[in-house]
């Protein structure tokens, strides 16, 4: 004969554990049902009655099967330098990530607590290491024979064009100027850009349309300009 299926609450066999999505209640000394994600335990089980679950209250969530008496509070609204990549629902916390041009200066378990603007390298300096989701841009002086004439968080130093006859020699912040209209060899005229860091979580880089409440929360304010490092600007 097949073993009889026990319905919660039930006393487990000595030495055995409760089944999946059940927990052992110490007070009742019974295996009882857990509550599903998006719910919490409103009334704990007894020897004769199972757990009573209730939906999470507004702005709270539970992500796992649980028997917590209260759901967890969602994090604060995302600040203006952030994008909400996951909304607060009954089953998941809000996740805020930094918008393009910013990086996460202070991360939390999921998403970012504090975003800061990516450093911009000033003319004469180029990007040595591009910014990522969690690290700032590193600038370096343009080596002899290269230049950058932009203030940018993505442009690297580019080689000077090579002239038959040089009218004005190039320097770290300016390309060489040739007397003839056609230099013997020229690099591609467009600035060289490094790719912006893209949030791996985000399905989109633009904030999703919101109700009239614009996200701008008290402890999630953008940091001021990043501290000036050599060759960087806080603009």
């Amino acid at each position: 004969l097949p073993a009889q299926v026990a319905f919660t609450p039930y006393a487990p066999e000595p030495g055995s554990t409760c089944r999946l999505r059940e927990y052992y209640d110490q007070t009742a000394q019974m295996c009882c049902s857990k509550c599903s994600p998006g719910q919490h335990a409103k009334v704990f089980c007894t020897k004769t009655s199972d757990t009573v679950c209730d939906s999470c209250e507004d702005s709270t969530y539970t992500q796992l099967w649980n028997w917590v008496p209260e759901c967890l509070s969602c994090g604060s609204r995302c600040s203006s330098d952030q994008v909400e990549t996951q909304a607060c629902t009954r089953e998941q916390n809000r996740i805020c990530t930094c918008r393009p041009g910013w990086y996460c200066a202070l991360s939390k378990q999921e998403g970012c607590r504090l975003c800061a603007p990516l450093r911009k390298c000033r003319p004469g300096f180029g990007v040595a290491r591009p910014g990522t989701e969690t690290s700032d841009v590193v600038c370096k002086p343009c080596a002899p024979g290269t230049f950058s004439n932009t203030t940018s968080s993505t442009d690297i130093c580019r080689p000077h064009q090579i002239c038959n006859v040089v009218a004005i020699p190039g320097n770290a912040s300016m390309d060489a100027v040739c007397t003839s209209t056609s230099p013997t060899r020229s690099m591609a005229p467009g600035a060289v850009h490094l790719p912006q860091p893209v949030s791996t979580r985000s399905q989109h880089t633009q904030p999703t349309p919101e109700p009239s409440t614009a996200p701008s929360t008290s402890f999630l304010l953008p940091m001021g300009p990043s501290p000036p490092a050599e060759g960087s600007t806080g603009d």
Epitope: D58, S73, T213
Partner: antibody
């Protein structure tokens, strides 16, 4: 754009009941709550209750538990407030307002209000 | 129930004045759950500040909010003619959710 449009003014006799509607447009009704707030003439705002249109779950101020019935019809994106056993002191403007789930109850859009006058 | 008490109940001020309205809760309210509304005569209330200190888009930066626990403040840094209205605080921390009695800001 987001709009909450309420039904027109009502004049009722004591003991009667009234049903006020609030039609929503410009947003998804799924992850919002619809609240009802009343304001007696020259008085402040009083929260009466709220409904989750997706589930029909309601929550009331106990003061209005037996007085007000909240309902909604998602097929026409409309929330309703029915007030029974009307008395002169129920004369007020009744507002519907929405709060998105996850916004900690901030009511970001309001209806224009419905004046209910109870007089014999 | 959590009682919300605003002070003053009314005040007279001139254009350009700095105005401060306080809201005291009878028990502690999480800052995320404290909001302020502005209401003009014959109009529906309008969300002015959410979660203690945050301005919805379109609300001028002369409005600001602060506070924690039981004491919260709404400040208008430089009163403008269109700011003459009644202001309400609102807690959503514990049901039933309650409003302050309102503070009427009038022209001096």
């Amino acid at each position: 754009q987001v709009q909450l449009v309420q039904s027109g003014s009502e004049l009722k006799k004591p003991g009667a009941s009234v049903k006020v509607s609030c039609k929503a447009s410009g947003f998804n009704n799924k992850d919002i709550y619809m609240h009802w707030v009343r304001q007696a003439p020259g008085q402040g705002l009083e929260w009466m209750g709220r409904i989750d249109p997706a589930t029909g779950n309601t929550k009331h101020d106990p003061k209005f538990q037996d007085k007000a019935v909240l309902s909604s019809d998602t097929s026409v994106s409309t929330a309703y407030l029915q007030i029974s056993s009307l008395k002169a002191e129920d004369t007020a403007v009744y507002y519907c307002a929405r709060s998105p789930y996850g916004d900690f109850g901030a009511m970001d859009y309001w209806g224009q209000g419905t004046l209910v006058t109870v007089s014999s | 129930d959590i009682q919300m008490t605003q002070s003053p109940s009314s005040l007279s001020a001139s254009v350009g004045d700095r105005v401060t309205i306080t809201c005291t809760a009878s028990s502690s309210v999480s800052s995320n759950y404290l909001h302020w509304y502005q209401q003009k005569p014959g109009k529906a209330p309008k969300l002015l500040i959410y979660s203690t200190s945050n301005l919805p888009s379109g609300v001028p930066s002369r409005f600001s909010g602060s506070g924690s626990g039981t004491d919260f403040t709404l400040t208008i840094s430089s009163l403008q003619p269109e700011d003459f209205a009644t202001y309400y605080c609102h807690q959503y921390h514990r049901s039933p959710w309650t409003f302050g009695q309102g503070t009427k800001v009038e022209i001096k």
